[in-house]
Interface confidence: medium
Amino acid sequence: AITEAREEAKPYPLFPGPLPGSLQTDHTSLLSLPHTSGYQPALMFSPTQPGRPYTGNVAIPRVTSAGSKLLPPLAFKHTVGHIILSEHKDVKFNCSISVPNIYQDTTISWWKDGKELLGAHHAITQFYPDDEVTAIIASFSITSVQRSDNGSYICKMKINNEEIVSDPIYIEVQGLPHFTKQPESMNVTRNTAFNLTCQAVGPPEPVNIFWVQNSSRVNEQPEKSPSVLTVPGLTEMAVFSCEAHNDKGLTVSKGVQINIKAIPSPPTEVSIHNSTAHSILISWVPGFDGYSPFRNCSVQVKEVDPLSNGSVMIFNTSASPHMYQIKQLQALANYSIGVSCMNEIGWSAVSPWILASTTEGAPSVAPLNVTVFLNESRDNVDIRWMKPLTKRQAGELVGYRISHVWQSAGISKELLEEVGQNNSRAQISVQVHNATCTVRIAAVTKGGVGPFSDPVKIFIPAHGWVDHAPSSTPAPGNA
């Protein structure tokens, strides 16, 4: 370590010889103290004579009695001004001051860069009393200095509410360059220029920067820190780092990977979660995003049917969540489903295709030619219909649902009957006389209940009347 000591002429000699604990320029014999910050205040013994200093940075004591000599102005003795040393070395420096015994409650505190150093045990204050003055030496030691110890240290002494401040002692801890800004990983567009920044500081300065790409130096001549590297463009992933050099040696930054944005990989694991007659709920696991966020996805659906025209239905959806309800599908049909996702570069390939089926649907048409007769002798209503022309997708007919509503003065009640798929007629008991009966019929499959036929009404008179209602929906060709 190098030590620069600044000496100036002193107007008043404080001590006849060197003080104990003065600066050791070789830093070899130091106090063995823990590395914490702070100070230990020193309290003077109560002097015999009272006294009050003048205000100001230097306190000039009054004459205490006739014939007594003038005491020197109170000021810290000049000491070393600048200490330069390497990281992890030990250092000790001190402030010294000679204080007339007339002053009471004298404390010395250490300050660094304007902040008081509190609560540490590596500051020590020693007292050397004489007849009229007490020499005070405040020592500060740091073991294994770090960059954070760099700064300006001063001593402050308070005497009767007055403050005396020492000259600063500058500690400069030198070491390998220290990065304040390192290059960052980036995802860049292929063949597009981008910048990387590297900044390192000493001391010692200057710090010079070399850039390294994939283990090879980019610049033959170093650049002074900070350095910005403009890369004209990459066609493939590369790793960049920077080397920071100063007189103490070299520090290498972290290596950062520069990825090239590319098309995503195809999604995987397309799964079917739920199928209904007209919809299928799917999910997928997104592929690698190509170092560029997914924008959206496309669900492609092909009907697997030799008679279909092979056209592909495309449903666009957001990239997240990785789920989509495919709607508007035919019932009881087989589909092949694939998913592709895109980022700013382009579309991924399609995922592996998976097969999925919709379930049976409910019938889409109502039974035809619904007719209603009153069978007065048996006191029931005779209902007849024709089987609806259902599509294969509606699934297998399992029966019919008959709704009959009875309305008379102030009364209305609906009843439902279920009959088997082989029936095309049914009889229902008369519920109320002197009332209107409204009949509707729907076909039923495993997929659900189809639409009801148009209502057919018949009036149920008091006994002795007969009424007949025409069919509600004419059979094809009879219109």
């Epitope: 063949n191 066609t235 382009g346």
Partner: antibody, heavy 120, light 108 residues
Framework: QVQLQQSGPELVKPGASVKLSCKAS????????INWVKQRPGQGLEWIGW????????KYNEKFKGKATLTLDTSSNTAYMGLHSLTSEDSAVYFC?????????????WGQGTTLTVSS | EIVLTQSPTTMAASPGEKITITCSAS???????LHWYQQKPGFSPKLLIY???NLASGVPARFSGSGSGTSYSLTIGTMEAEDVATYYC?????????FGAGTKLELK
């Protein structure tokens, strides 16, 4: 569907040059590289280089620098490879292949290959 | 450049047999960067497996891939007559892109 259609077989004399073509269809031409791969009779596959249709940039295998030149005609979605100063060592089947590039590199579609015979 | 060494160079197998082909890289290749191709006689190569273990579209499930670092393998669970071909590994990590010399699979 994705297709890479290559030009027909070529018979050329030593010292001459030749230009092979590869017409792409069924996808966005500018999104993917077109690569060229050499296969000598009974031998393995050797990567020659790629061309990136979005900006025309190229990347060559050092071994083929000066031997092969990759170019494009984006209006017709066609990639070309010129081969110069031909010798019998250049007799081979040359494939074009679409480069699927997502920070790793593989060839997801291939042309049918063009047979080049260099003979006097 | 990364050199890929395949073994065996040629092999004969009967239908139903399990086949394993290995590919060794001269320096470490992340598993994301190792791919396999199948080339049948008189045809262009076809992508078989990408990223070490992902089957390309339309490839039967009897094919599988595994490995990491410098050691990779391609397995055919049960050999079929249509699998007669030459199989190549390829690394997509470092330019120049390189292929293995190939493994020729024949029918016993």
């Amino acid at each position: 569907q994705v297709q890479l259609q290559q030009s027909g077989p070529e018979l050329v004399k030593p010292g001459a040059s030749v230009k092979l073509s590869c017409k792409a269809s069924g996808y966005s031409f500018t999104t993917y590289d077109i690569n060229w791969v050499k296969q000598r009779p009974g031998q393995g596959l050797e990567w020659i280089g790629w061309i990136y249709p979005r900006d025309g940039s190229t990347k060559y295998n050092e071994k083929f620098k000066g031997k092969a030149t990759l170019t494009l005609d984006t209006s017709s979605n066609t990639a070309y490879m010129g081969l110069h100063s031909l010798t019998s060592e250049d007799s081979a089947v040359y494939f074009c292949a679409r480069g699927y590039y997502d920070n790793l590199y593989y060839f997801d579609y291939w042309g049918q290959g063009t047979t080049l015979t260099v003979s006097s | 450049e990364i050199v890929l060494t395949q073994s065996p160079t040629t092999m004969a197998a009967s239908p139903g047999e399990k086949i394993t082909i290995t590919c060794s890289a001269s320096s470490s290749v992340s598993s994301n960067y190792l791919h396999w191709y199948q080339q049948k006689p008189g045809f262009s190569p076809k992508l078989l497996i990408y990223r070490t273990s992902n089957l390309a579209s339309g490839v039967p499930a009897r094919f599988s891939g595994s490995g990491s670092g410098t050691s990779y393998s391609l397995t055919i669970g049960t050999m079929e007559a249509e699998d007669v071909a030459t199989y190549y590994c390829q690394q997509g990590r470092i330019v120049p892109l390189t292929f293995g010399a190939g493994t020729k699979l024949e029918l016993k």
